[in-house]
Interface confidence: low
């Protein structure tokens, strides 16, 4: 908000304003307005001779502003010429602006059909296990007054969730300055907003308009299960479609999925509606929709919904899924070679082909740089030459190979490790 | 909006869900919940053993997932053991999860209770001359049908212009698809805009909540002075104060300055109510408030209210606002030396002291740069020895100096200039 | 661990003042409601004050109201209870406890004991 | 206000007996916001029953509530030397019975 007083010199012709006098012949003006006022209305300079005497002053367009600076970009600058014949000490000169046409507005306004009462103030929540009182406070003026009573008034309180918007809010009419709010009016483990706002009563003899909105209150309802989908809602368009929609923590929804399930009459088969919607509200909650197909409003007119838990299964196939326990792994040496053996743990079942993966390296390498070797059904493998007298470490895993079953590798073996001879030298 | 078909896969333990087997003893499945769903909800792996039975699965917390990646930043990794006896080829698990309480909501929804009507489709604007026409459309389903039928229908109309707020915006009730607004709904030369919705009449059979708000619709409205001020309006508290309002466009506002004017009666004096307030109101119009003093509103009960420019003068005192005429300068020459002499116009009144500042400088140097004196009622100045063979000028101005006359400086002289003579060589 | 655990209690004359604190860790202190709930020597439980999770609801006994001031710092993990004009009957073991929803008090402190006394 | 009162004020009773502690309102609770707790000397209350009947983490299954409205029991079937003390009932998170002792006979 900004402050003006009564007389307070605000327009840009006025603060640019500017006259001087050489003293013996004439009087110099220069001022400025705007080119986008111009568009709308022109204003005229004018100079008060004596209290009834008010003469227009002809100016001319001017290229520059030596005397003042325009606080507008696009100034029109003016330069005018008095001629005057006699200046004394005392002389003071009265300058104004007047528009190019009468402007203005003219409205008679009855008391007691322009009535707005006063807001509420100190709006405050208390509460008393799971219900809510709000109370607030009017000022009625003086009570000698009586011009505007209590009884020509009552008070709008609305209230919603903080991630709803007003224009959802709930409404409650209240005739005294305070409203309880109980768990039929308010959802669990919510935080709720209220405002409140007085309007004339509807057998006051006033008319009007309601106060501004009260300062808004925040509040935790009573407490409740959060795992609990809420907030549960449904309506018919009157042709063919029940749309519902529901909230479910996100926390919740990320866990467990919630589907809507409906029934045309108590004895008839459930069925779960499809395909569901979702978008999010503000930050804590999911809101998903779905739209129940009402093929006969006339014969069914009652249909009972219910969000419940879907029974999502996955279905896994065990022969697809195998994931044998690791071999055992053993190193032999065989005269001047190494060999690698190992055992699988029995399967009951001995057609099932067997793919082994087989790797080995020396102590300082590491798995990634090892050799990698693929063998099926075998259960050894015969070593190329190795490097003398370095330590070797090997590993082998295994997975199932035939037609019609799989899986995924095996843990690896326990990794065995062993030092190759060193050779003699020739001489 | 997302969109989900009733059995997609969708929460963090069904997708992270894997299980593998050895084919001989022993299924081992591996999941992951939230930390954040846990606070409010756990959730436990349920085997289907047949149609009928359900068994918990066991799990403890593991430190890995090494089959899948957890879509979530706090994820808790779990793994689970079933022993198992025998393995076919055709064998599927089927697995689910199951939260440790009952979790949903339930509602018995009542056809005719649960009415939410169609929203209007089409909403467009006609006009002839001043008036407006507001047409739209509604799908009531088969014609058939007569579920829903026109009668129990009404629309909702609520325009504003661009500026204002949905909460402020004047509502129309029609019970067809069209609604007229006049001038006497809208104030000339503003940007309006509309939108329609359909809700439940109050004599149908049906009840339920209104439709959703049709898109938008905007117009001009019919032309008028947009230089004039708007929206004066007033409403008493009840108590002691009249509060008015009322808008202007920005630009004008710059260069005409409303007042508002007051009358507690028709045969009472006019009075100006003091401070306004301004405040911004969108990009085009200035809002501006004012508080009239209601001091007895059972004897004055109706004010007449007008918004009119104000006469704001700017007082400027002759003799503190002298510019005299620029002096004439001349140069002469006395000898070996140069002097200044210059000139004022006759002023009515000798008394007036005079002060001149007089500026001389080399034909190369700028202003700026010159040498400046400043003498009192003097006319004339001897120059100091200049350079030969050199052009010089000089300029002088004048401004009033005596005590309770005051001014700003004349304009310059204008300049003279002149050229030093050679000095003739010494032999 | 879960844990609650008070301090600042002492002995106090009648009239005097004092400032109780609770603090909490190896949970979401934020995520639930707090309460004081006091036991005098010999006595049975009496519960004394309650805060909501983010500290917009405040309820008090009758016997404390206008004497006792709840409040709780969720940064700093802490609830908070000062004490003014204490009178004899206020000595009692004090104690912190937690409440979520409807499931009850399930995580209490060890106490701290404040006694008023000329 | 809600007052609670409990009965009988001590319970004398061998171990292997089954308790039976009950709690009165003076008006209608939801069986939502009823809980029963424990407490021995010199410790703190420990949490044993909420919303009337569910038993909280760790509770052995000895122990089970039940009720609505105005009536609401604690059953312990079976005393174990540990479950020798005082019980309180509490309504909506404030107000607590006076407290019943069992105590061995």
């Known amino acids: 908000w900004e402050r003006s007083l009564a007389g307070a010199e605000e327009t840009i012709p006025l603060q640019t304003l500017r006259c001087y006098n050489d003293y013996t012949s004439h009087i110099t003006c220069r001022w400025a307005d705007t080119q986008d006022a111009q568009r709308l209305v022109n204003v005229t300079l004018i100079r008060r001779v004596n209290e009834d005497l008010l003469e227009p002053v002809s100016c001319d367009l001017s290229d520059d502003m030596p005397w003042s600076a325009c606080p507008h970009p696009r100034c029109v600058p003016r330069r005018c010429v008095i001629p005057c014949q006699s200046f004394v000490v005392t002389d003071v000169d009265y300058f104004s602006f007047q528009p190019d046409r009468p402007l203005g507005t003219r409205l008679t306004v009855t008391l007691t059909q322009h009535v707005q009462p006063p807001e509420p103030r100190d709006l405050q929540i208390s509460t008393d296990q799971d219900h809510f009182l709000l109370t607030w406070s009017v000022a009625l003026g003086s009570p000698q007054s009586h011009w505007l009573s209590p009884g020509d008034l009552e008070f709008e309180v609305v209230y919603k969730r903080l991630q709803d918007s007003w224009e959802d809010a709930a409404i409650l009419l209240s005739n005294t300055s305070q409203a309880t709010l109980g768990p039929e009016h308010l959802m669990p483990s919510s935080t709720y907003v209220a405002r409140v706002r007085t309007r004339l009563a509807p057998g006051s003899r006033l008319s009007g308009r309601p106060s501004k909105w009260s300062p808004e209150v925040c509040w935790d309802s009573q407490p409740g299960d959060e795992a609990q989908p809420q907030n549960l809602e449904c309506f018919f368009d009157g042709a063919a479609v029940l749309s519902c929609s529901w909230e479910v923590r996100k926390e919740v929804a990320s866990s467990v999925s919630f589907g809507l399930f409906y029934k045309p009459s108590p004895d008839a088969g459930e069925e779960e509606c499809s395909p569901v919607l979702r978008e999010g509200l503000g930050s804590l909650h999911t809101r998903h929709h779905c739209q129940i197909p009402v093929p006969d409003p006339a014969t069914h007119g009652q249909y009972i919904v219910s969000v419940q838990p879907r029974r999502a299964e996955k279905h896994i196939k065990s022969s697809v899924n195998i994931q044998m326990a690791p071999p055992s792994l053993n190193v032999t040496k065989d005269g001047d070679s190494y060999s690698l053996r190992w055992e699988t743990m029995k399967m009951r079942y001995e057609h099932i082909d067997h793919t082994f993966e087989i790797q080995y390296r020396k102590d300082t390498a590491t798995w990634k740089d090892s050799k990698t070797e693929t063998l099926q059904n075998a259960h050894s493998m015969a070593l190329p030459a190795l490097e003398p007298s370095t330590r070797y470490w090997a590993r082998v895993r295994v997975r199932t190979s035939r037609t019609g079953y799989n899986g995924i590798w095996s843990e690896w073996s326990e990794a065995r490790s062993w030092d190759t001879e060193s050779v003699l030298p020739m001489w | 909006w997302e969109r989900s078909l009733a059995g997609a896969e969708e929460t963090i333990p069904l997708q992270t869900l894997r299980c593998y087997n050895d084919y001989t003893s022993h299924i081992t499945c591996r999941w992951a919940d939230t930390q954040d769903a846990q606070r409010l909800v756990n959730v436990t792996l349920i085997r289907r053993v047949n149609e009928d039975l359900l068994e918990p699965v066991s799990c403890d917390l593991s430190d890995d997932m090494p089959w899948s990646a957890c879509p979530h930043p706090r994820c808790v990794p779990r793994r689970c053991v079933i022993p198992c006896q025998s393995f076919v080829v055709t064998d599927v698990d089927y697995f689910s999860f199951q939260p440790d309480r009952p979790l949903g909501t339930r509602l018995t929804v009542t056809l005719t209770q649960h009415v939410q009507p169609p929203e209007p489709r089409d909403l467009q604007i006609s006009t002839d001359q001043d008036h407006f026409l507001l047409t739209w459309s509604v799908a009531l389903g088969s014609p058939q049908s007569h579920w829903l039928s026109p009668g129990d229908l009404e629309f909702e109309v609520v325009y504003k212009r661009l500026q204002d707020s949905w909460e402020d915006a004047a509502i129309l009730l029609s019970n067809t698809s069209q609604a007229t607004l006049g001038p006497e709904h809208l104030m000339p030369s503003s940007t309006y805009v509309a939108r329609v919705r359909t809700r439940l009449a109050p004599g149908s059979r049906l009840s339920g909540r209104p439709s959703k708000w049709s898109p938008e619709v905007c117009w001009d409205s019919q032309p008028g002075d947009e230089a004039q001020p708007q929206n004066l309006e007033c409403f008493f508290d009840g108590a002691a104060v009249l509060s008015c309002s009322w808008e202007v466009r920005k630009e004008v506002a710059s260069s005409v300055s409303f007042g508002l004017f007051y009358k507690p009666s028709p045969d009472a004096g006019e009075e100006e109510c003091s401070p306004v307030l301004r405040e911004g109101l969108g990009s085009l119009h200035t809002r501006h408030h004012c508080q009239i003093p209601v001091p007895d509103p059972a004897t004055h009960g109706q004010y007449i209210v007008s918004v009119q420019p104000r006469r704001a003068e700017k007082h400027i005192k002759s003799s503190v606002n002298i510019q005299m005429a620029p002096p004439s300068l001349n140069v002469t020459k006395d000898g070996d030396s140069y002097s200044l002499r210059w000139e004022t116009m006759k002023m009515r009144y000798e008394h007036i002291d005079h002060t001149f500042e007089i500026q001389y400088r080399k034909d190369t140097a700028t202003w700026k740069d010159s040498k400046t004196e400043t003498l009192q009622n003097a006319h004339s100045m001897a120059l100091p020895a200049l350079e030969p063979s050199t052009r010089y000028w000089a300029r002088v101005r004048v401004r009033t100096s005596r005590t309770g006359y005051n001014g700003i400086w004349s304009e310059w002289s204008e300049a003279r200039s002149w050229d030093t003579e050679s000095v003739l060589p010494m032999w | 661990q879960v844990q609650l655990v008070e301090s600042g209690g002492g002995l106090v004359k009648p009239g005097g003042s004092l400032r109780l604190s609770c603090a909490a860790s190896?949970?979401?202190?934020?995520?639930?409601?707090m309460n004081w709930i006091r036991q005098a020597p010999g006595k049975g439980l009496e519960w004394v004050s309650y805060?909501?999770?983010?500290?917009?609801?405040?309820y008090y006994a009758d016997s404390v109201k206008g004497r006792f001031t709840i409040s709780r710092d969720n940064a700093k993990n802490s609830l908070y209870l000062q004490m003014n004009s204490l009178r004899a009957e206020d000595t009692a073991v004090y104690y912190c406890?937690?409440?979520?929803?409807?499931?009850?008090?399930?995580?209490w402190g060890q106490g701290t004991t404040v006694t008023v006394s000329s | 206000e809600i007052v609670l009162t409990q009965s009988p004020g001590t319970l004398s009773l061998s171990p292997g007996e089954r308790a039976t502690l009950s709690c009165r309102a003076s008006?209608?609770?939801?069986?939502?916001?009823l809980a029963w707790y424990q407490q021995k000397p010199g410790q703190a209350p420990r949490l044993l029953i909420y919303g009337a009947s569910s038993r909280a983490t760790g509770i052995p299954d000895r122990f089970s509530g039940s009720g609505s409205g105005t009536d609401f029991t604690l059953t312990i079937s079976r005393l174990e030397p540990e479950d020798f003390a005082v019980y309180y009932c509490q309504q909506y998170g404030r107000t607590f019975g006076q407290g019943t002792k069992v105590e061995i006979k």
């Open positions: 190896g949970f979401t202190f934020s995520d639930y409601y």
């Open positions: 805060i909501s999770t983010s500290g917009s609801i405040i």
């Open positions: 406890a937690r409440r979520r929803y409807y499931y009850g008090m399930d995580v």
């Open positions: 008006q209608s609770v939801s069986s939502s916001y």
